[in-house]
């Protein structure tokens, strides 16, 4: 994976989400869960601090179906 000490912001973040999520597409925020009243967005999680592949993949959209 990428160097974990580095953060991903702007175009770097969009590039990486596009490559990792591929056909699934991606979101910049996830729905709030019962555990957390406020969902942290990917900018907060990956731009303000470093994030790994597993975290990035949680922002991939649910797989779509073929036409």
């Amino acid at each position: 994976a990428y160097r974990p000490s580095e953060t991903l912001c702007g175009g770097e973040l969009v590039d990486t989400l596009q490559f990792v999520c591929g056909d699934r597409g991606f979101y910049f925020s996830r729905p709030a869960s019962r555990v957390s009243r406020r969902s942290r967005g990917i900018v907060e999680e990956c731009c303000f601090r470093s994030c790994d592949l597993a975290l990035l993949e949680t922002y991939c959209a649910t797989p779509a179906k073929s036409e």
């Epitope: 994976a1 990428y2 160097r3 580095e6 953060t7 991903l8 175009g11 770097e12 590039d15 990486t16 596009q18 490559f19 990792v20 999520c21 591929g22 056909d23 699934r24 592949l53 993949e57 797989p63 779509a64 179906k65 073929s66 036409e67």
Partner: antibody
């Protein structure tokens, strides 16, 4: 028109190193993430490495992690693949590629052949 | 990783006849993408999003399928279609290709 031209391939002994280059033209190189894909002789296609447009994010297939390093110089419109500790199974044609969303691996260079042999 | 399995490995078809290539994914994928590779050339994007023709691709090529099973069809084989065809999935990281299907003229 997108043009990608690879160079740097050749015959190398196991354990040695090689650096591949890919010169890009016909598009705004610094706006695009890039990848390397390889093809062993008579075999299928295998994604090798990814680098984001600014170079801050890189990913590798498991078999090359720790041995290969992808990098780029946006001022020279050039992509690189530094290959260390080469193995016989790394023998392949190496292609540099880029994508538009949904048009995955849409643009390819002609490839450069790397042969790892003693 | 999702494993892509193409069948058959090779097929020989008479000029003007139909050629059908199958691609099966080890897990469900959103879409399938197909590439054509002629001898000594890099692969070329042929079909994206399961069924959409890439620019300049003749309409004798078509793609279909969903879930884990997808098909590339050449409705009337032409001499210039002799090539190896690969499927690709981009629904799961990392991207994975099928092993290829060689199409020849009978």
């Amino acid at each position: 028109e997108v043009q990608l031209v690879e160079s740097g391939g050749g015959v190398v002994q196991p354990g040695r190193s090689l650096r591949l280059s890919c010169a890009a033209s016909g598009f705004t190189f610094s706006n695009y993430y890039m990848t390397w894909v390889r093809q062993a002789p008579g075999k299928g296609l295998e994604w090798v490495a990814y680098i984001s447009s600014g170079g801050g994010s890189t990913y590798y297939r498991d078999s090359v992690k720790g041995r290969f390093t992808i990098s780029r110089d946006n001022s020279k419109n050039t992509l690189y693949l530094q290959m260390n500790s080469l193995r016989a199974e790394d023998t392949a044609v190496y292609y540099c590629t880029t994508e538009d969303y949904g048009y995955w691996f849409a643009y390819w260079g002609q490839g450069t052949l790397v042969t790892v042999s003693s | 990783d999702i494993v892509m399995t193409q069948s058959p490995d090779s097929l020989a078809v008479s000029l003007g006849e139909r050629a059908t290539i199958n691609c099966r994914a080890s897990s469900s994928v959103s879409y399938m993408h197909w590439y054509q590779q002629k001898p000594g050339q890099p692969p070329k994007l042929l079909i994206y999003g399961t069924s959409k023709l890439a620019s300049g691709v003749p309409d004798r090529f078509s793609g279909s399928g969903s879930g884990t099973d997808f098909t590339l069809t050449i409705s009337s084989l032409q001499a210039e279609d002799v090539a190896v065809y690969y499927c690709l999935q981009r629904s799961s990281y990392p991207p994975t290709f099928g092993q290829g299907t060689k199409v020849e003229i009978k």
